[in-house]
Interface confidence: low
């Protein structure tokens, strides 16, 4: 098979030798009967470059051909070549170079006595010769010609057609349709590549992604896909992935955590506007944000507690002496005194020391403005020292501490995390700097919490963030941390980087994985 870009085709159609004579006017010998002259005719064809004056001599630069005997004297030639398998009509001259658009053609009709002797050198055998030169453009149409020399006529036609996959004026443009990794196209009339639907680019190797797929952050391996580059997500790969653990934040670029209004911290998890978001202060108290998710409440008179949730009972413990009854007023109280007593808290008595009013060894002294007062010994109280003091009754110990009455004093046994005489000092659990890797410590009650920097987690920020934390492995796969990445150990029947692909069922037998196919398939 000669490689070529096109072919010159010559179709011999009809030859007429009216008298059966040679070119030298001699009779063709060898007739078996009348007519006496019978020219057994074959042809020599020579195709060469354009010559202003055509020379029949070699070389036939574009090719030459010698036909078998095609007929006697006058005959027509069918397309295809007829009975003789050694001859095909049209005669084809393949070209391995660009068709120049011009040619010279020599056709000699020759006579032979024997079908086996097709020598063309003997001039005595020549019946007629045509020598012509022509311009010819590439095309399917045949150019028809008739050569007459008086005694003979030769009717023939010719054309130059491109080989399959060759196009253009000189058949110099090569285009073979394909639909594989190297291109997805058919060929246009001039040999230009016409991309199949879904493909683009000079060689139609670039798939056209899902319409709307972000050109920068998405890509595709086949038409209509939209696969996201690292850090992007969504159907069109136009949503950035926030920093892992980002709570009340957004991103413009991957791994950002830009806090929404009112939020702060690395993960935007610290409420900077706790007062507005949560309204923690009760009973008309004033709330003040103190940052990092904390606040303070300024209580209105008559209220107490961290959120001013407790109404203060000014009658507790009872301020009224000598059996006076107490009435709670807003931010105040009033005492109703029993007979014989008076004063704001019924502290004044109509009695005097002469009446011996002081009990339990209390020392009595008369007051200049009337009445008396008792100075009680240790362990007793009351206007008349009538009450044995229960030092724990006033609940002097804070934060759940246990109060121990020592007779003339008390002792507070603090719960874990508190200290001080009344257990009202919160022990600073951050003092030992428990947060590793630059974490920020926040003190609690017998506790602390750490706000970790990016890349760390755990109670003490000592654990690097697990790349498996966000469950990247699908279909029951096991995720393993692998230093600079994670690796999914797929369940049987699944494959792909994240075990997201259902593998085709294999016939039973040993599990041999085709390494090349499998890996290239994942690319």
């Amino acid at each position: 098979q000669v490689w070529s870009s096109g072919v010159f085709e010559l179709k011999l159609q009809e030859f007429v030798n009216k008298k059966g004579l040679l070119g030298n006017r001699n009779c063709c010998r060898g007739g078996a009967g009348p007519p006496p002259c019978a020219c057994r005719t074959f042809f020599r064809v020579c195709l060469k470059h354009y010559q202003a004056s055509v020379s029949p001599e070699p070389p036939c630069t574009y090719g030459s051909a010698v036909t078998p005997v095609l007929g006697v004297d006058s005959f027509s030639l069918p397309d295809g070549g007829g009975a003789d398998s050694a001859f095909s009509n049209p005669i084809r001259f393949p070209f391995g170079f660009t068709w120049p658009g011009t040619f010279s053609l020599i056709i000699e009709a020759l006579h032979t006595d024997s079908p086996d002797d097709l020598a063309t050198e003997n001039p005595e055998r020549l019946i007629s010769r045509l020598a012509t030169q022509r311009h010819l453009t590439v095309g399917e149409e045949w150019s028809q010609d008739l050569h007459s020399s008086g005694r003979t006529d030769l009717k023939y036609s010719y054309r130059f057609v491109c080989d399959e996959h060759y196009y253009g004026e000189g058949c110099s443009v090569f285009c073979r349709p394909r639909d594989d990794a190297f291109g997805h196209f058919t060929c246009g009339e001039r040999g230009e590549k016409v991309c199949n639907p879904g493909w683009k680019g000079p060689y139609c190797t670039e798939p056209i992604c899902l319409p709307g797929c972000d050109e920068q952050h998405g890509f595709c391996d086949k038409p209509g896909e939209c696969k996201c580059r690292v850090g992007w997500q969504g159907r069109y790969c136009d949503e950035c992935i926030r920093y892992p653990g980002c709570l009340h934040g957004t991103c413009q670029q991957p791994w950002q955590c830009n806090c929404q209004e009112g939020w702060g911290g690395l993960f935007c998890n610290q409420d900077l506007n706790y007062c507005t978001h949560h309204k923690p202060c009760k009973n008309g108290a004033t709330c003040t944000n103190t940052g990092q998710g904390s606040y303070t409440c300024s209580c209105r008179p008559g209220y107490t507690g961290a959120t001013c949730e407790l109404g203060i009972d000014e009658c507790d413990p009872s301020p009224c002496k000598n059996g006076g009854s107490c009435t709670d007023l807003e931010n105040s109280y009033s005492c109703t005194c029993p007979p014989g007593f008076y004063g704001k808290i019924c502290e004044l008595s109509a009695m005097t020391c002469a009446d011996g009013p002081c009990f339990n060894g209390g020392r009595c002294s008369d007051s200049p403005d009337g009445g008396y007062s008792c100075r009680c010994p240790v362990g007793y109280s009351g206007f008349n020292c009538e009450k044995k003091i229960d030092y724990c009754s006033s609940s002097p110990c804070s934060n759940g501490a246990k109060c121990v009455d020592l007779g003339d004093a008390y002792l507070c046994r603090c719960q874990a995390g508190f200290s001080g005489r009344h257990c009202d000092d919160n022990v600073d659990d951050c003092a030992s700097s428990p947060c590793a890797n630059g974490g920020t410590c926040r003190d609690g009650v017998n506790d602390f919490s750490c706000t970790c920097p990016p890349g760390y987690t755990g109670r003490n920020c000592s654990a690097p963030v697990s790349r498996c934390e966000h469950a990247p492995c699908h279909n029951g796969a096991t995720c393993h941390e692998r230093g600079h990445r994670y690796v999914c150990e797929c369940a049987r029947g699944y494959g792909g980087p994240n075990c997201q692909f259902l593998l085709p069922e294999l016939p039973p037998g040993p599990a041999v994985v085709d390494l090349t196919e499998k890996l290239e398939g994942q690319g």
């Epitope: 580059r229 690292v230 393993h480 941390e481 692998r482 230093g483 600079h484 990445r485 690796v487 999914c488 150990e489 797929c490 494959g495 792909g496 980087p497 994240n498 075990c499 994985v513 390494l515 499998k518 890996l519 290239e520 994942q522 690319g523």
Partner: antibody, heavy 120, light 110 residues
Framework: QVQLVQSGAEVKKPGSSVKVSCKAS????????ISWVRQAPGQGLEWMGG????????NYAQKFQGRVTITADESTSTAYMELSSLRSEDTAVYYC?????????????WGQGTLVTVSS | DIALTQPASVSGSPGQSITISCTGT?????????VNWYQQHPGKAPKVMIY???NRPSGVSNRFSGSKSGNTASLTISGLQAEDEADYYC?????????FGGGTKLTVLG
Amino acid sequence: QVQLVQSGAEVKKPGSSVKVSCKASGGTFSSYAISWVRQAPGQGLEWMGGIIPQFGIANYAQKFQGRVTITADESTSTAYMELSSLRSEDTAVYYCAREGYSDYSAFDYWGQGTLVTVSS
Amino acid sequence: DIALTQPASVSGSPGQSITISCTGTSSDVGTYNYVNWYQQHPGKAPKVMIYRVSNRPSGVSNRFSGSKSGNTASLTISGLQAEDEADYYCSSWDEHSYVFGGGTKLTVLG
């Protein structure tokens, strides 16, 4: 067919640095990890570190931490390994190797190796 | 430096079977199924023969097989052939990095 082609042999003086390249062709470069493995004359294999070009994050063996830098250029499908503060015991053949992902996890394609000789 | 322990050498006659062991710890061979075996002929780059304990890449003879028990992995070559003569290295992942065995030289006698 995947191919990893490494740069040529190098002769270096102690204390200097060497940078070896590894160009990949015939596969998807970014999706796979590229590791560097060395082999001293007559000795066994030693993993130095690796990188997934897609993430640009490198991981190094503790022994080489601070002395080796592994980088990758996605646009040219090339990985690089730079080893600094060279000493005579760094004389070895340095291989780059592609690691099949997830369900494969082995070095399935290797470069031809680059001999680095450290000598004064 | 060598984290996994392999015998320095093993030998066998053609047609015989041999087994090369690779002993690690609970933090590499014992934990992960990332045990790989590589064959290396002199002057050549290594070639993976078994990956993930017991899987054989396409193109590798079924005479090669792998297994694991506890902290020890094994490579078995049955029906030994002359071309099997080479160095064999086991490798595993140990949470942060790849570790290799010291290598085993396989000699095919005769």
